[in-house]
């Protein structure tokens, strides 16, 4: 059994006689020989569903859930309730109704098993018959609406009539109506004005039933018409087994460059036209097992369950259904020497499915595991400036398919030809297993004889030990000139153009910084800075050389404070900054401000405090002080 | 009608162990939390601890927290007291009590055993 | 924790007079209180909780007022069968707490 609505309405006025009819509440049958039977919960309770009194006023026939007004309600008995309110004012209460024999606890009240009923009070007696508007003769304040399971026998889930205006206004005439389109399974009784289901609702046809309800009041020698909505919901039983949508069940798939743990190998599409068991339950009542092959596959592989709701047409109005993606995952990184081939089976079982017909369904993996040769190119050769900096990026090298490679461990390694001319290093790129070239020696690329670098680049896979090896030609280019005095260590430090490019600093490849212009547009990424180099730096990612030292690149690498318009970037650096951003890495510190103030305003600024607010620059408010400002002149 | 029966009280020495159950019927024991509460001779009320309806959460006096442990099996409509490392001031009358709880409220107790008298003494 | 603390701790009274017992709590406990009797040998029995909800079978004279931290229990009419020890408990918080009790005597 269950109540066809979970919460119902009705008006309450002061001393409404006793024997007032109230409403009915029903319920529908969810087996044939049910019989309900109806029992009102202990209490009454106000806002905020606290207790205010035991309920002695308001009685429940137990067989046919009509309620009815057992004694009135006095207005000293409504101020007792008042006062129990925990200090809100009282404008409903409402009550529990139970379907006997029922699981739940009394302390709780959810649907199917229990319904509220409010009651809105009135401090005044039921009004004169005839100032009552053709609205309140005809239906209650709060709309009501309706759930109806699936596959249940029909029965009678409302009554149309308000039967206290019924039982204080019997002169006045209301029929009721049901505004619906041929073939639909719903039935008004004229005489009863009860509204019953013809025959058991299927959901997968169709889930919402939007009606209409026509009320016309006679008073008289006047007829007056009322419409409300009508809306019914039918709610979802497991009674849909899954399927494989265009009869699909089987998935291939070739594991090469991708190795990582939690890649996705494969994925199969199970259809089921149901939306029950709901999200909370769905993986453990939706069960898949990866049927037990060898060792090394049930090692290797699992399966993940991700169900989604999705909506399908049916006769013309759309229902929701549920699609669940059932992926192949790797459950450890695989070494680049394995190379099998397999065949995995997954059963999908669909527990709460009765049938008929089974709720299990086998989907089919073919895998094929790769091996992975590692490849450089037979040489490489590229350019490196004199004047190049400590920690300046040079170039790449990569083995064939690294953009590709995740969980592929491959580092790099350089073998100098020249001992005195070892200049540069190498360390490999987590981001696509490539190795960044980087100047590590500045003395030896100043040695007039180390004009021609020679190395052998060597890229290992330490898990298997498997080796590919280039040729590295590095020409050295152009002519050392020394820095200015005075220039500091990164060049993140200048804030202005033309300090800027008039120094060097770490990470710098042609011994000068580089000036980017940003775009002026608020807190932006693209904000104004001075780097060792644009094409790295800032770039909103710390990469694997700048981690070497954090005056190469602080805009991307710094973990300490930001003072300024700014958003800070995940984990470290300035994701986005206002105007120009310049930083002092022994400082931990960067600074982000408009880019327009000239000195002589900076000067004035400085003996004051400046406040860069929140609606000036979009981003957190900062306060800059004195302290902070002497930076700006840095030079 | 409704009724909680204590049971397993005595005579025990300091810090020996004792059980004590509380057998409860007439209602759906399943739907409520339980409470102990103690009342030493000649003394006030005392709350001991209480669980939660299914089980699954549980809360103790400071005075008797990680010595005592509460526990109950709905399938007997049993609820249950495990009192380990006692003391002479656990020396007490011990009752079981049905906690009223409504719709997220708690409302005390409601119905009450009459209490299984321990003794800790040497 | 939250302490409760229960005045008088005895009162002598006669049949027919008004008794108000109060109970203080250490910080408001938003109603969360309720009043039990308790009789020589017997179990305590819950006269009123939420502040001021009459437990069903329980006289009329019994009342309870109060919120935040000041909670009274009153009886209006004292009869010969309210002679008794009379509890407060707060069931805001865990862990519950009592008062101290009241007793109410025979002047």
């Known amino acids: 059994l269950y109540f066809s609505r979970d919460a119902y309405w009705e008006k309450l006025y002061v001393d409404q006689p006793a024997g007032t009819p109230l409403l009915y509440v029903h319920a529908l049958r969810d087996a044939p020989e049910e019989v309900p039977s109806f029992r009102l919960g202990q209490h009454l309770y106000g806002t905020y569903r606290t207790r205010l009194h035991e309920n002695n006023w308001i009685c429940i026939q137990e067989d046919t859930g009509l309620l009815y007004l057992n004694r009135s309600l006095d207005r000293s008995s409504w101020e007792k309730l008042s006062g129990r309110n925990r200090g809100f004012p009282l404008l409903t209460v409402y009550l529990k109704v139970f379907l006997s024999p029922t699981s739940l606890r009394e302390g709780e009240c959810q649907w199917p098993g229990c319904a509220r009923v409010y009651f809105s009070f009135f401090n005044t007696s039921f009004p004169a018959c005839t100032s009552l508007k053709p609205r309140e003769l005809c239906f209650p304040e709060t709309r009501p609406s309706f759930r109806i399971r699936e596959n249940r026998p029909p029965g009678t889930f409302h009554q149309f009539r308000l039967l206290p205006v019924q039982f204080l206004c019997p002169n006045i005439s209301v029929a009721y109506r049901l505004l619906e389109g041929e073939g639909l399974p719903f039935r008004c009784a004229p005489d009863s004005l009860e509204v019953s289901t013809r025959w058991a609702l299927d959901r997968e046809q169709r889930e919402k039933y939007e009606l209409v309800a026509v009320c016309t009041v006679h008073a008289g020698a006047r007829e007056e018409v009322v419409m409300v909505p009508f809306p019914v919901t039918v709610y979802d039983e497991d009674d849909s087994a899954p399927t494989f949508p265009a009869g699909v069940d089987t998935a291939s798939a070739v594991v090469e460059f991708k190795r990582k743990e939690d890649t996705v190998v494969a994925t199969l599409r199970v259809f089921d036209a149901d939306v029950v068991p709901a999200s909370g339950e769905l993986v453990r009542r939706y069960t898949s097992t990866l049927l037990p092959g060898d060792t090394w596959t049930q090692q290797t592989f699992r399966v993940e369950h991700w169900p989604n709701e999705t909506s399908v047409q049916a006769n013309g109005s759309f229902v929701r259904a549920t699609v669940h993606d059932y992926r192949l995952v790797l459950n450890r990184n695989l070494s680049i020497s394995e190379n099998r081939t397999m065949q995995l089976a997954v059963l999908v079982n669909d527990s709460d499915f009765q049938g008929p017909g089974a709720g299990v369904l086998l989907l089919h993996f073919n895998v094929s595991v790769l091996p992975v040769s590692l490849h450089l190119p037979s040489s490489y050769s590229l350019s490196v400036s004199r004047r190049a900096r400590r920690f300046a990026q040079i170039g790449k090298v990569c083995v064939e398919n690294c953009q590709a490679f995740s969980g592929i461990n491959v580092q790099y390694e350089l073998h100098s030809s020249g001992a005195n001319c070892s200049t540069l290093g190498v360390v490999t790129s987590a981001e696509d297993t490539s190795g960044i070239l980087f100047v590590n020696d500045t003395k030896a690329l100043r040695r007039p004889k180390c004009a021609e670098l020679h190395y052998m680049v060597v890229a290992t896979n330490h898990q298997t030990s498997r080796q590919a090896q280039a040729q590295l030609l590095v020409t050295v280019e152009g002519l050392y000139v020394a820095e200015e005095a005075g220039c500091p260590l990164s060049c993140a430090v200048s804030k202005r153009r033309p300090e800027c490019e008039e120094c060097g600093g770490l990470g710098s490849p042609t011994g000068r910084c580089e000036w980017r212009q940003g775009d002026g547009k608020g807190i932006t990424r693209n904000f104004s800075t001075c780097s060792p180099s644009t094409k790295t730096c800032p770039d909103g990612h710390c990469d694997v050389v700048e981690t070497q030292d954090i005056n190469i690149c602080p805009q991307d690498c710094l973990r300490g404070s930001i003072v300024g318009g700014h958003e800070p970037g995940e984990p470290r650096g300035i994701k986005a900054g206002y105007g120009t951003c310049n930083c002092f890495p022994e400082e931990e510190k960067c600074f982000c401000e408009p880019e327009d103030i000239q000195d002589p305003l900076c000067d004035e600024l400085c003996r004051e405090q400046k406040l860069i607010s929140e609606e000036d620059l979009g981003g957190e408010q900062k306060l800059i002080s004195e302290e902070d400002l002497h930076h700006h002149h840095h030079h | 009608q409704v009724q909680l029966v204590e049971s397993g009280g005595g005579v025990v020495q300091p810090g020996r162990s004792l059980r004590l159950s509380c057998a409860a019927s007439g209602f759906s024991f399943s739907s409520y939390g339980m409470h102990w509460v103690r009342q030493a001779p000649g003394k006030g009320l005392e709350w001991v601890a209480v669980?939660?309806?299914?089980?699954?959460?549980?809360y103790y006096a400071d005075s008797v927290k990680g010595r005592f442990i509460i526990s109950r099996d709905n399938s007997k409509s049993t609820l249950y007291l495990e009192m380990n490392s006692l003391r002479a001031e656990d020396t007490a009358l011990y009752y079981c009590?049905?906690?009223?709880?409504?719709?997220?409220?708690?409302?005390?107790?409601?119905?009450w055993g009459q209490g299984t008298t321990v003794t800790v003494s040497s | 924790d939250i302490q409760m603390t229960q005045s008088p701790s005895s009162l002598f009274a006669s049949v027919g007079d008004r008794v108000t017992i109060t109970c203080r709590a250490s910080q408001d406990i938003r109603y969360d209180l309720g009043w039990y009797q308790q009789k020589p040998g017997k179990a305590p029995k819950r006269l009123i909780y939420a502040s001021s909800i009459l437990e069903s079978g329980v006289p009329s004279r019994f009342s309870g007022s109060g919120s935040g931290t000041e909670y009274t229990l009153t009886i209006s009419t004292l009869q010969s069968e309210d002679f008794a020890i009379y509890y407060c408990l707060q069931h805001n918080s865990f862990p519950w707490t009592f008062g101290q009790g009241t007793k109410v005597e025979i002047k």
């Open positions: 669980m939660w309806y299914d089980g699954s959460n549980e």
């Open positions: 009590a049905r906690e009223d709880w409504d719709e997220g409220y708690y409302y005390g107790m409601d119905v």
